[in-house]
């Protein structure tokens, strides 16, 4: 059935967060459709989204087997209409994607304050652990569960009058932090991964909670 | 099978350096914490530090900050650990390990140990 | 730094018979994210490296006996061998896997009786 016609996938990228890890990349297709392989770097290729007229293929399935494997994907293009056949040879054209490293390269989502609880002179903010796809036996990990101590988190805090802002980090999903009384303050997160050197050692802030709302509770 | 290879015994004079390496093989090196463990003659472990090779990010104990430097190649998977002045309380039992595959889930590989020994 | 102190320093032990340590960190260490405690224990053989038996606190590490059991939270953990065998002779020691500076007991000797 040859492969006339048809042009190589490029610009592979990888999009992940919390590994949730899909694989993006161009043209979209005319009259062609695309197949996607992954191994690691001593693994076999196994594949993935036969055949499909998208142009992102998620491997969540795959990397969160072994998050800590570096990863290598390639991208097939086949005549629309394609059907695997035994007896052709000649081989599809195709694009490797950049080694991923999921442990070290997925982003960090962003955070959610699931409470925080005024007692006197001190406010505790606790941040939600986030559920990842990664699994030990038949349950799922947390965040914290896959990064442990490697994952820190901050807290921007302020009081709602003023704009200065204080800062405060923890190494577990809890602040305990000192307020003025009778002040009320706002808070945000961010979760961050000091070990990392790149972009994606820190999240986005999460929303804003403010002292006076729903999420907040006050005892004297 | 994962491993992790210490280089061999040392016998050193105070105030020499001395750098001692721990190659890694049979899993990814960049992901994985390489520790460093203290045990002088008779005693306890003592933590000195780590390297996540695939960064270069280092944590140190206080008591070992500014004496010893942790490093890594990842090129060859191997890490080390070194003294620009060695002294003579520096004669000890040196291991390295590596991190278990979960979040802080203790040291799941050890190296067989390089003996450091320090006397004039 | 968290300080983590053992007790026996010495259990001498009749093999089949149960042996108990005891590890009592200074502060706590359960992770409030994922209610997990990083506590860690190993057994250091005779002229041997050390060598992980539990994690979190209760997690057996694969290949070890299921003589062998953790528990505890918070500041006070327990490692119990069931049934002690000539084989676990050594120094076995707790860890505080929480946060840095990581922190080792000072070790308890079990030997046979």
């Known amino acids: 059935s040859g492969t006339t016609n048809t042009v190589a996938a490029y610009n592979l990228t990888w999009k992940s967060t919390n590994f949730k890890t899909i694989l993006e990349w161009e043209p979209k297709p005319i009259n062609q459709v695309y197949t996607v392989q992954i191994s690691t770097k001593s693994g076999d290729w196994k594949s993935k989204c036969f055949y499909t007229a998208d142009t992102e293929c998620d491997l969540t399935d795959e990397i969160v087997k072994d998050v800590k494997q570096t990863y290598l994907a390639r991208v097939f293009s086949y005549p629309a209409g394609h059907v695997e056949s035994t007896g052709s040879t000649e081989e599809p054209p195709y694009e490797n994607s950049p080694e991923f490293t999921p442990y070290l390269e997925t982003n960090l989502g962003q955070p959610t304050i699931q409470s925080f609880e005024q007692v006197g002179t001190k406010v505790n903010v606790t941040v939600q652990d986030e559920w990842t796809l990664v699994r030990r036996n038949d349950t799922f990990l947390s965040l914290r569960d896959v990064f442990g101590k490697d994952l820190i988190y901050t807290l921007y805090y302020w009081k709602s009058s003023s704009s200065g802002k204080k800062t405060a980090k923890t190494n577990t999903n809890e602040f305990l932090i000192d307020v003025d009384k009778g002040e009320n303050y706002c808070f945000s997160v961010q979760a961050v991964i000091p070990s990392r050197r790149t972009a994606n050692r820190k999240s986005t802030d999460s929303p804003v909670e403010c002292m006076g709302h729903e999420k907040g509770e006050s005892r004297e | 099978e994962v491993q992790l290879v210490q280089s061999g015994a040392e016998v050193k004079k105070p105030g020499e350096s001395l750098r001692i390496s721990c190659k890694g093989s049979?899993?990814?090196?960049?992901?994985?914490?390489i520790e460093w463990v203290r045990q002088m003659p008779g005693k306890g472990l003592e933590w000195m530090g780590d390297?996540?090779?695939?960064?270069?990010?280092?944590n140190y104990s206080p008591s070992f900050q500014g004496h010893v430097t942790i490093s890594a190649d990842k090129s060859i998977s191997t890490a080390y650990l070194q003294w620009s002045s060695l002294k003579a309380s520096d004669t000890a039992m040196y291991y390295c390990?590596?991190?278990?595959?979960?979040?802080?889930?203790?040291?799941?590989?050890w190296g067989q140990g390089t003996l450091v020994t320090v006397s004039s | 730094d968290i300080v983590m102190t053992q007790s026996p320093l010495s259990l001498p032990v009749t093999p089949g018979e149960p042996a108990s340590i005891s590890c009592k960190s200074s502060?706590?260490?359960?992770?409030?994210?994922?209610?997990?405690?990083?506590l860690t224990w190993y057994l250091q053989k005779p002229g041997q490296s050390p060598q992980l038996l539990i994690y979190?606190?209760?997690t057996r590490e694969s290949g070890v006996p299921d003589r062998f059991s953790g528990s505890g939270s918070g500041t006070d953990f327990t490692l119990k061998i069931s049934r002690v065998e000539a084989e676990d002779v050594g120094v076995y020691y707790c860890?505080?896997?929480?946060?840095?500076?990581?922190?080792f007991g000072q070790g308890t000797k079990l030997e046979i009786k």
């Open positions: 390990a590596r991190s278990g595959y979960y979040g802080n889930s203790g040291f799941a590989y």
């Open positions: 049979g899993y990814t090196f960049i992901t994985y914490w």
């Open positions: 390297i996540l090779p695939g960064s270069g990010s280092t």
């Open positions: 502060q706590s260490l359960l992770s409030s994210g994922n209610q997990k405690n990083y």
């Open positions: 979190w606190a209760s």
């Open positions: 860890q505080n896997d929480y946060t840095y500076p990581l922190t």
